[in-house]
Amino acid sequence: MGRARDAILDALENLTAEELKKFKLKLLSVPLREGYGRIPRGALLSMDALDLTDKLVSFYLETYGAELTANVLRDMGLQEMAGQLQAATHQGSGAAPAGIQAPPQSAAKPGLHFIDQHRAALIARVTNVEWLLDALYGKVLTDEQYQAVRAEPTNPSKMRKLFSFTPAWNWTCKDLLLQALRESQSYLVEDLERS
């Protein structure tokens, strides 16, 4: 990940346990930019600084994630820490003058796709793997990859093998896997989004 993620992690790791708890509670009610969802309360409250950083980046991307983190820190009265975070994220890109919103920047890496956000849960909970493989065969999976996944003994190991190929996939390949999940295990997709 990029500089912004590291800066968010650095800020959150410098919070006391009590401050981190307060940060999470404020995050549940902080105003969000249009088009962004809120991290579910249940998942949020149990996270440590590292998990929370990853969640912030996956939900809000690096640029907005850093901005949102700084806003919450400022709201907690931690102006200096918020300033350090923003300074760190603008290093090398030139900060916008005070009072002027910096133009949207593309994140160092695009935000996480739904299947990347929920990788662990999908590995643990997908049962209809054969159906997924048939849906992806020839479009996303080569014959060799298809056979390699099928050869695994359990559903989790099949899914783990399938996910071993996803780093090479583009966004539309991941969308095809998500489509297959919507078609075959809709209840699971809905449940993951709620979680």
């Epitope: 088009g35 962004y36 969802g37 996956s58 939900f59 991307l61 640029t63 949207p104 920047q105 593309s106 994140a107 695009p110 935000g111 996480l112 796709h113 739904f114 956000q117 583009n170 966004w171 539309t172 390949c173 969308d175 095809l176 998500l178 489509q179 919507r182 078609e183 809709s186 997709v189 809905e190 993951l192 989004e193």
Partner: antibody, heavy 122, light 107 residues
Amino acid sequence: QVQLQQSDAELVKPGASVKISCKVSGYALTDHSIHWMKQRPEQGLAWIGYMYPGDGSANYNDKFKGKATLTADISSSTAYMQLNSLTSEDSAVYFCTRPYYFGSSYDYFGYWGQGTTLTVSS
Amino acid sequence: DIQMNQSPSSLSASLGDTITITCHASQNINVWLSWYQQKPGNVPKLLIYKASKLHTGVSSNFSGSGSGTGFTLTISSLQPEDIGTYYCQQGQSYPYTFGGGTKLEIK
């Protein structure tokens, strides 16, 4: 706020090509896919396909493969759709649109360009 | 491709009425359905997503229900600003497909 600004109406001759633009503001172009829709007068909407500017990948409706080509220029925050070998059947309003929520379980379109009217006539 | 059949194709109702538009998918699409409103000369506007979730800023007079193959959009207490054409759209499988539209007029 999020805005999608499309290019002006086009009048082109049969057999020609046209490139419609969709300039986005209020977010980074690379953060969301851009989808394109076709609407003919007194007819419904048809999904043409989408591209994800973050990696340049695209997914087309089979009905529009060979007809539409989707691209993007990140430096100008602009997505494009080129339509070629135009006929009167291509006369329509074309919309660019963006899913409302990043990383969602499915695409629902909360942001739309104002539409570009394409007229194909000799 | 998944076909989306919408009915009625047009309807006329009085102010204050409650009206219902239905959408039938040719195969199971679970809850992956959206509803849009398009006023004359305007762009489509998202009303409902995931079959029943009201989009932000949309009047609570609109509601959606259904799953699988049958879906309903209900508009209660019809207002003058509700005139326009309503479309359903399945978002489960590519290519995404729309219903043919329902044109709503006020009597």
